[in-house]
Amino acid sequence: AWELTILHTNDVHSRLEQTSEDSSKCVNASRCMGGVARLFTKVQQIRRAEPNVLLLDAGDQYQGTIWFTVYKGAEVAHFMNALRYDAMALGNHEFDNGVEGLIEPLLKEAKFPILSANIKAKGPLASQISGLYLPYKVLPVGDEVVGIVGYTSKETPFLSNPGTNLVFEDEITALQPEVDKLKTLNVNKIIALGHSGFEMDKLIAQKVRGVDVVVGGHSNTFLYTGNPPSKEVPAGKYPFIVTSDDGRKVPVVQAYAFGKYLGYLKIEFDERGNVISSHGNPILLNSSIPEDPSIKADINKWRIKLDNYSTQELGKTIVYLDGSSQSCRFRECNMGNLICDAMINNNLRHTDEMFWNHVSMCILNGGGIRSPIDERNNGTITWENLAAVLPFGGTFDLVQLKGSTLKKAFEHSVHRYGQSTGEFLQVGGIHVVYDLSRKPGDRVVKLDVLCTKCRVPSYDPLKMDEVYKVILPNFLANGGDGFQMIKDELLRHDSGDQDINVVSTYISKMKVIYPAVEGRIKFSTGSH
């Protein structure tokens, strides 16, 4: 028998520095977690203790904190090289700055293979990107070889900016011939490493003949066997065992997100490359694990540029940006409009001639807007200003919801109106009219939404049975502020970009902003 240790991360999202337990900014260092310096300590400890170790990343290193905003992926290559990652799969967020924003900082600078079997380049890009990412890689591990085949969510064109010269194929269809190729090279131990979410990971384990282990990402899935060590609730045991169509037991793993855990899976293979046994658990990277001093020193050196960036002007406002709770929790506020407009602008993807855009709607809990910005400071808006407005380090995500769920959400928005509660919704691409004289649960008297399948966008009444795409904070997608109906009834949920980054990019693009209160949210009394 031959034993392999797979260490894995996924959806790190720019958490190079240690974070608080909820993966936001570290405040009390003695209780902070994760970060590349701490990760390196644990990885090195395992490498010294065990003979055959692979450190793998299942995508979405890009996007999530000011580190990515400033360094644009150079930080990912630098620190992944320093940690000696063995391979990485491309995630959807690796395309957030376009193909060039992937090629130059990461693909050309990584000292390890970067993989995806279901992304095919065409046209002029094909020769430019050739060899910079691979469908699979065979790696030497001890005296053996291990094949790693990559995959990426085929939804990436809707979630990021891969351009028109990359085709995202069906994962299973694309993986099978690559695995077959590995078999012809006499590679009999094969890991599928990718970024399509836990449901697809399980399908790959079931359907792709020859895959021995699946290491996934995208869905931030936490798996654990036994008593979990922190706040995350396990979606299943670690590893999650799938019985393949040809009768094999295939372990599937994922390690939550944000570098909080290091996935740790031990696999035993027989001489023919069959999995005999698999066991392990994610390792919580808490403060009991010291940060490696040399990596920490390097982090501190790179940090300097971030502090400078925070105070630079992104753009100007010529109006007061009213982010006060007195406004945003009671009525339409122009800070809410600005943020929602930025959220929609960040999700412009012309993927179909029938649609001017794939999404037109935004909702945003008023309680998530934490500060106004005064225009009487020369109009200057900085990252620091925006961090006061959006201090929670969230993301603006894409969900699919039925009209009936949206109606429930808007009823919830005003079910206890007048108490300055955070659930009052700010909107974009939506016109809502409330009648507060009616009883809670029946206060939405008009709900019109901006069409997407149209050349001239206009507002049409919401249809209860229709499925709509909506951009919203991850906080709402997860049922925060009492929006349980969103969490329970959403049909699809894809993580998006860092909230501050979305707004800062929009302001930089617009240069001068003047958002108004324009009648998106109205109140009426009387008959309708």
């Epitope: 000292k111 293979p113 060899g131 790696l139 030497p140 005296d143 070889v145 090279l185 006499n186």
Partner: nanobody
Framework: EVQLVESGGGLVQPGGSLRLSCAAS????????IGWFRQAPGKEREGVSC????????YYADSVKGRFTISRDNAENTVWLQMNSLKPEDTAVYYC?????????????????WGQGTQVTVSG
């Protein structure tokens, strides 16, 4: 465009020496491990030696240990194979190969790019 070009082959007497070079272009050599392989007429290609990108760690096939030395100069984008005490059974076409990874081995499946080869003939 990625290219590997071998040179330095030729005809040499048993006991003699040759220095093969592998010139890389189109990629930064310091990110790549380089391997030397050989294929004798009617035989399968076999791993001879390789050198890792990270710490210059080396591998040698048992048949060449103590006689062959691999080295690299990243600035010159070149890897050399110094072959001493050559034997008739060293006669083969010698290929260099590259992979983007820290470590290497004699398994040919791990390599991404291959040169066209240079002929080495050891004959008295």
């Amino acid at each position: 465009e990625v290219q590997l070009v071998e040179s330095g082959g030729g005809l040499v007497q048993p006991g003699g020496s040759l220095r093969l070079s592998c010139a890389a272009s189109g990629f930064p050599l310091d990110y790549y491990s380089i391997g030397w392989f050989r294929q004798a007429p009617g035989k399968e290609r076999e791993g001879v030696s390789c050198i890792g990108s990270s710490d210059g760690s080396t591998y040698y096939a048992d048949s060449v240990k103590g006689r062959f030395t691999i080295s690299r100069d990243n600035a010159e984008n070149t890897v050399w194979l110094q072959m001493n005490s050559l034997k008739p059974e060293d006669t083969a076409v010698y290929y260099c190969a590259a992979l983007k990874y820290y470590y290497c081995s004699g398994h040919e499946a791990i390599y991404d790019y291959w040169g066209q080869g240079t002929q080495v003939t050891v004959s008295g």
